[in-house]
């Protein structure tokens, strides 16, 4: 009786595997001792003419590693649209604006990247801006998360190495589809599916946890998950189904916080792992995946239990010529408002990159046409003209883009929130009833925060985008909310107030604050007109006194 089975590529529609990794084709991490500014350099290599990238910067929360000032250099070989997120820190971006296009204007200082040809020249130039903290070269990334702040265990010099594991400093998700294989196990009755993930050893062997997220939408009650990795890998498993789990090392399961389960010895070959699945009565290996050393793996199986299907031989086709993408073109249209004027500036180079030919750009009132400058089409109007619709807090219009004859025009609704008509305030409370505001917080005591917007309005929705507590030069920057998610177990996003004001609570542990001090609580608010998805941001802050429990005056 055959133990193994012939693994075949799986039709990608049946499931997908995505992962994030810290391994880059070339890179290094260093600690920039006593540097006021840390410099990070990203070399991005894209295969296609136009790519999309999500780039997120995260501020470090480790003691003594407060992020002071950051200089980020982005070097791309091709055109790339960047969706950018960063905490409220002094940030400088250097990039070639003819290649790198940011969706929305990042709220940062921008430096033009000089025309340098070699990586060495770019690195020499970057070194004049501050101490280089990280360098990474990435092949076709889809998303990157860069952790700011110093790594005290890193060397003092950043010397790029091939196939470098960037550790906690950088995680990225490749765009390339991970090959998934599958096979039937002959001679096994019943229907039990096996999902096998094999992590290959990396260049650096240090203890690490791999998070495995698995989402199955099948109707079979029976499944097995087999995870094999190098001896230094333990696993954190987040799955929506109950199933048998077999792993090397040690694992814990999200639904049981704090659980630890000892793994077992597993064979180190694909066929050996398949044999283990057979021992557990699996009748089909629904997905077999081999990956480099990763941080997170997400496995989605959308049609498990259906007819077993492998991918047909690829058919060679000629890709269609790139044509103007309305979606990307629309994303370039971002209104800016202030002093009772709405302005839109469309970068002509970016329009060209998208291979779009525009013959006109107007507001709803077509007599209000864009002005053609050297490098931009600029459409501007006071709130009182060009068909602007003005309500208590929102100003709206419609932008019409015309193309050469034969193509219908594109229309996009644009809106601005009239910031001058709204006021925002942070309130700190010591009980979940949000009755009496305070400006003093005791270490170890739960604090409750509410963002109040006045006057009350249903026209604008407010969300907490990020919040942090700056404990001054002696202390750390404590990230409380990042990317609309509570950071750590001490922070909880609460239900909004009856009026819709965002609320959250946090617990300031004693070890987070070296000595009783004052701090600044800052929140970045994402404001959105209720009829549109485009957001604007507003930062609100308040000063806090932080006292030790014994100094609080409580008897």
């Amino acid at each position: 009786e055959r133990v193994g089975c012939d693994l075949q590529p799986v039709d990608p529609t049946r499931g997908e595997v995505t992962f994030t990794t810290s391994q880059v084709s070339e890179g290094c991490v260093a600690q920039a001792a006593n540097a006021v500014r840390e410099v990070h350099v990203l070399f991005l290599d894209f295969p296609g003419m136009l790519s999309h990238l999500e780039l997120t910067l995260q501020a470090s929360k480790q003691n003594g590693t407060e992020t002071q000032e950051v200089f980020l250099v982005l070097v791309s070989n091709k055109n790339v649209f960047v969706k950018f997120q960063a905490p409220e820190i002094p940030l400088h971006l250097a990039y070639d604006s003819s290649l790198v296009i940011f969706q929305g204007q990042p709220r940062v200082n921008i430096t033009v990247l000089p025309s340098l040809t070699s990586r060495k020249q770019i690195l020499d130039w970057a070194a004049t801006k501050g101490a280089i903290t990280s360098i990474a070269a990435l092949d076709d990334p889809q998303s990157i998360v860069l952790q700011l702040g110093q790594d005290p265990k890193a060397p003092f010099l950043c010397l790029p190495e091939a196939h470098k594991d960037m550790g906690a400093t950088l995680e990225w998700q490749p765009r390339a589809q991970t090959p998934v294989q599958s096979c039937r196990l002959e001679g096994v009755s019943g229907h039990k599916e096996a999902y096998i993930l094999r992590i290959l050893p990396g260049s650096e062997a240090g203890p690490r946890t791999v998070t495995v997220m698995m989402e199955l939408s099948c109707t079979s009650g029976d499944a097995i998950l087999i995870l094999h990795g190098p001896p230094y890998v333990s696993w954190f498993i987040d799955i929506n189904h109950s199933m048998q789990i077999l792993t090397t090392g040690e694992y814990s399961v999200k639904i049981f916080p704090g659980s630890k389960v000892k793994g077992v010895e597993l064979p180190d070959t694909p066929q050996g792992l398949i044999a283990e699945a057979r021992k557990l009565n699996a009748s089909i290996v629904t997905s077999f995946v081999e990956l480099p050393l990763v941080s997170n793996v997400s496995l989605r199986a959308s049609s498990c239990g259906g007819v077993f299907q492998t991918t047909p031989a690829p058919v060679v086709t000629t890709p269609p010529k790139d044509t103007c993408s309305p979606v990307l073109l629309m994303s370039l249209i971002q209104p800016k408002c202030g002093n009772q004027v709405m302005t839109l500036a469309l970068n002509k180079k970016h329009v060209q990159t998208l291979q779009c030919t525009i013959t006109g750009l107007t507001f709803w009132d077509s007599s209000c046409q864009a002005e053609d400058t050297d490098d931009h089409l600029v459409l501007s109007s006071a709130y009182s003209s060009c068909g602007m619709k003005v309500t208590a807090h929102v100003v709206s219009n419609e932008v019409i883009i015309s193309f050469p004859s034969g193509s219908p025009p594109l229309r996009k609704k644009v809106q601005c929130i009239d910031m001058d008509s709204l006021s925002f305030q942070l309130g700190l409370y010591l009980s979940p009833h949000f009755l009496q505001a305070s400006n003093t917080i005791e270490l170890g005591q739960q604090a409750f925060v509410q963002v109040s917007v006045s006057p009350l309005t249903s026209e604008v929705t407010v969300q907490l985008d990020s919040c942090h507590l700056d404990l001054g030069p002696e202390g750390d920057m404590v990230e409380l909310i990042q990317s609309r998610t509570a950071k750590g177990s001490c922070v909880t996003l609460l239900s909004p107030s009856p009026e819709g004001d965002p609320r959250f609570s946090f617990l300031l542990r004693v070890y987070m604050v070296p000595t009783p001090t004052a701090g600044t609580l800052s929140c970045n608010l994402a404001l959105r007109p209720s009829t549109l998805s485009q957001e604007v941001y507003k930062t609100v802050s308040m000063r806090l006194n932080i006292v030790s429990p014994d100094l609080s005056g409580k008897g």
Partner: antibody, heavy 117, light 106 residues
């Protein structure tokens, strides 16, 4: 807090069917399995099966195939077990228990089913 | 089916340490769980996946073992621990319970 409230005791005739309910509160009903367990006096505990309300997946102890049918109503966060062709052997206390990976972390108070003519 | 064998009864004095064993007829990985049941009540989870203490359970209770031999330990035993203790495995189909160990206090 997590609570599983089971329906009241049942006195039923042999050959008939009974449907008992288990109303969940205090957690996301669709994120956990709901297990059903039988306990006869002096006979210990017997696992009947589980249902995953998230997508209706079920897994049965083969011994109860055809005897027990597990269903769940997401809108009311209620799990049901129907027992059919009842005999005196089915007289027992039936528990529902919230679970994952076969662990029953919260249990209902139990429903006494008595089959008697 | 996987048969779980428990000793039927134990009698100990308060303050002592007691170990209740559960042996499986075949390997169950680490998927052994322990429950406490008092007369007229539903079972209560004490230990899950061999050694993990369930929420709200005193640290006097601990679990150990893997493969086929598992132990529930109570140290020290208190008067309130008088109950029947069941082991349960959820690795092999169908899931099965032990017959229970009745713990009495002297």
């Amino acid at each position: 807090q997590v609570q599983l409230q089971q329906s009241g005791a049942e006195l039923v005739k042999p050959g008939s069917s009974v449907k008992i309910s288990c109303k969940a509160s205090g957690y996301t009903f669709t994120s956990y399995d709901m297990h059903w367990i039988k306990q006869q006096p002096g006979n210990g505990l017997e696992w009947i099966g589980w249902i995953y309300p998230g997508n209706g997946n079920t897994k049965y102890n083969q011994k109860f195939n055809g005897k027990a049918t597990l269903t769940a109503d997401k809108s009311s966060s209620t799990a049901y077990m129907q027992l059919s062709s009842l005999t005196s052997e089915d007289s027992a206390v039936y528990f529902c228990a919230r679970g994952k990976f076969g662990v029953g972390d919260y249990w209902g108070q139990g429903v006494m089913v008595t089959v008697s003519s | 089916d996987t048969v779980l064998t428990q000793s039927p009864a134990l009698a100990v004095s308060p303050g002592e340490r007691v170990s209740i064993s559960c042996r499986a007829s075949e390997g169950v990985n680490s998927y052994m769980h322990w429950y406490q049941q008092k007369p007229g009540q539903q079972p209560k989870l004490l230990i899950y996946i061999a050694s993990n203490l369930a929420s709200g359970v005193p640290a006097r209770f601990s679990g150990s073992g893997s493969g086929t031999d598992f132990t529930l330990t109570i140290d020290p035993v208190e008067a309130d621990d008088t109950a029947t203790y069941f082991c349960q495995q959820s690795w092999n189909d169908p899931y099965t319970f032990g017959a229970g160990t009745k713990l009495e206090l002297k």
